[in-house]
């Protein structure tokens, strides 16, 4: 019960951090233009991984895209490289963790299987996490240089070099955002794991013990002491119970380390 | 169509509080902001301050402890109240309108003169 | 508060001159967000209120004839009216609309030679 508690909550923490990271990355306001000791402009400006926006006293707002690849700083392109990733990855671990939830039935997928995939999803997580705590941690570094660069003529904005006294710019909301999503997808992939412990059967040395009596082939489980007749109707061979014990012929069919006793 | 039309005391005492409403139609005022710009006879304009869309208040640094702008929507009228009156506060007094680009005023009402004297 | 210095103060013209105003202003206006130049050119005719011509430093308000253009950024912009015609002959003023407080030139005079 608390295994499918962790891993629910692990799914759902990394459900919320994963759309907040691909809010972040969508969102204008990485950077906005610092206010304190400044002018009163009668203009607002911001920044985002895709484009820069202008809001006038108005309310009017324009923002135009980056459309050059190659003039961008290689720092943004690598936040947004970062960024990528990171969904990328939470998307897929998302898409894993589904199928890996214990409460999910998924044809006769098998514990073991279960939390495999629950420990995929997990490391996907993290390194999701990591990537957009990563991303935005490299922009706000970035600012911070870039904050006390305040120049005339110093490259101002993500778009180009401009001939004016240069806006000083803060950090956004975005990065915020960015900073919270990473840590609680971080924390739920450290959940997943926690709960792919939890859900992988316990190994052991010990293999079901096969008693051959003549005239039927009957497997004797301790704790069970269900058997399996060869004859008459009953000619397939049952599971005894879901811990990973099997008749005879199952054993040897089908080896496995998690078979036990 | 876009109109604005400013009323006022035409003469006022010094030391005394002046009030002019500009009433406003064929816009919105919680969707365009609007400016006070005055101009004393003879002499260049000088802006006084604007109330925009959403409600934020700006003044001239000068005159920012005598003057206040407000508004009532539902009325479609903005209000400006000049405290302690000089006699340089003499001038004909205009509302304007503020266009969505470029914070520039692209419609003006026709002024009120205000006259300070004793 | 930022200075907007107008020159000359009037100008003495004929009609179909080509004419320039000036307008220099103590801080950029040039918003390196957009890199729009936030200047605007009025026009003034005795006991009327003012006409907006131009803003953004040159774009033309609509109905404005195409005779009149703004130019410049940052700190210096110019109002030309390529063909001046005995109507335009009144006062022009710039206006800083970047920095509070909206300061306005001393504005210029065109006069009939």
């Known amino acids: 019960m608390a295994v499918t508690a962790c891993q629910g909550l692990g799914f759902v923490v990394s459900l919320i951090g994963i759309a907040g990271i691909i809010a972040a990355t969508c969102m204008d306001q990485w950077s906005t233009q610092d206010l304190y000791n400044n002018p009163v402009t009668a203009v607002f400006n911001y920044q985002g991984l895709w484009r820069s926006c202008v809001r006038e006293s108005s309310g009017f707002t324009e923002c135009r895209g980056y459309f050059t690849l190659l003039g961008l700083p290689a720092m943004l392109q690598a936040v947004r490289a970062l960024m990528i990733v990171g969904i990328v990855l939470g998307a897929i671990g998302l898409l894993v963790s589904i199928f890996a939830l214990k409460c999910i039935r998924i044809g006769s997928m098998e514990d073991s299987a279960k939390a495999n995939m629950t420990l995929t999803s997990g490391i996907m997580f993290i390194v999701s996490g990591l990537c957009a705590i990563a991303g935005v941690s490299v922009f706000a570094n970035m600012l911070v240089t870039n904050f006390w660069m305040s120049t005339a003529n110093m490259y101002t904005g993500m778009g180009g070099m401009v001939q004016t006294v240069q806006t000083r710019y803060t950090f956004g909301a975005a990065l915020f955002v960015g900073w919270v999503a990473g840590g609680l997808t971080l924390i739920g992939g450290v959940m997943m794991c926690i709960a792919c412990r939890g859900l992988a059967p316990e190994e052991t040395n010990y293999k079901a013990v096969s008693y051959h009596a003549s005239g039927h082939s009957v497997a004797y489980k301790p704790g069970g002491f269900k058997a399996s007749t060869g004859f008459g109707s009953n000619t397939k061979n049952k599971k005894i119970y879901d811990g990973g014990a099997r008749t005879e012929d199952e054993v040897q069919s089908y080896p496995s380390k998690h078979d036990y006793v | 169509q876009v109109q604005l039309k400013e009323s006022g005391p035409g003469l006022v005492a010094p030391s005394q509080s002046l009030s002019i409403t500009c009433t406003v139609s064929?816009?919105?005022?919680?969707?365009?902001?609007v400016s006070w710009v005055r101009q004393p006879p003879g002499k260049g304009l000088e802006w006084l301050g604007v109330?925009?869309?959403?409600?934020?208040?700006i003044y001239h640094s000068a005159l920012k402890s005598r003057l206040s702008i407000s508004r009532d929507n539902s009325k479609r009228q903005v209000f400006l109240k000049v405290n302690s009156l000089q006699i340089d506060d003499t001038a004909t007094y205009y509302c304007?309108?503020?266009?969505?680009?470029?914070?520039?005023?692209?419609?003006w009402g026709q002024g009120t003169s205000v006259i300070v004297s004793s | 508060d930022i200075m907007m210095t107008q020159s000359p103060s009037s100008l003495t013209v004929t009609t179909g001159e080509k004419v320039t105003l000036t307008c220099k202003s103590s801080?950029?206006?040039?918003?390196?967000?957009?890199?729009?130049?936030?200047l605007t050119w009025y026009q003034q005719k005795p006991g009327h209120p003012p006409k907006l011509l131009i803003y953004?430093?040159?774009t033309r308000e609509s109905g404005v004839p195409v005779r009149f253009t703004g130019s410049g950024s940052g700190t210096d912009f110019t109002l030309t009216i390529s063909s001046v015609q005995a109507e335009d002959l009144t006062v022009y003023y710039c206006?800083?609309?970047?920095?509070?407080?909206?300061?306005f030139g001393s504005g210029t005079k065109l006069e009939m030679r």
């Open positions: 304007a309108k503020q266009g969505l680009y470029g914070h520039a005023m692209d419609y």
């Open positions: 206006q800083n609309v970047y920095i509070y407080p909206f300061t």
């Open positions: 801080q950029s206006l040039l918003n390196s967000g957009n890199l729009k130049n936030y």
């Open positions: 064929g816009f919105s005022l919680t969707s365009y902001g």
């Open positions: 953004w430093a040159s």
């Open positions: 109330i925009w869309g959403d409600g934020n208040t």
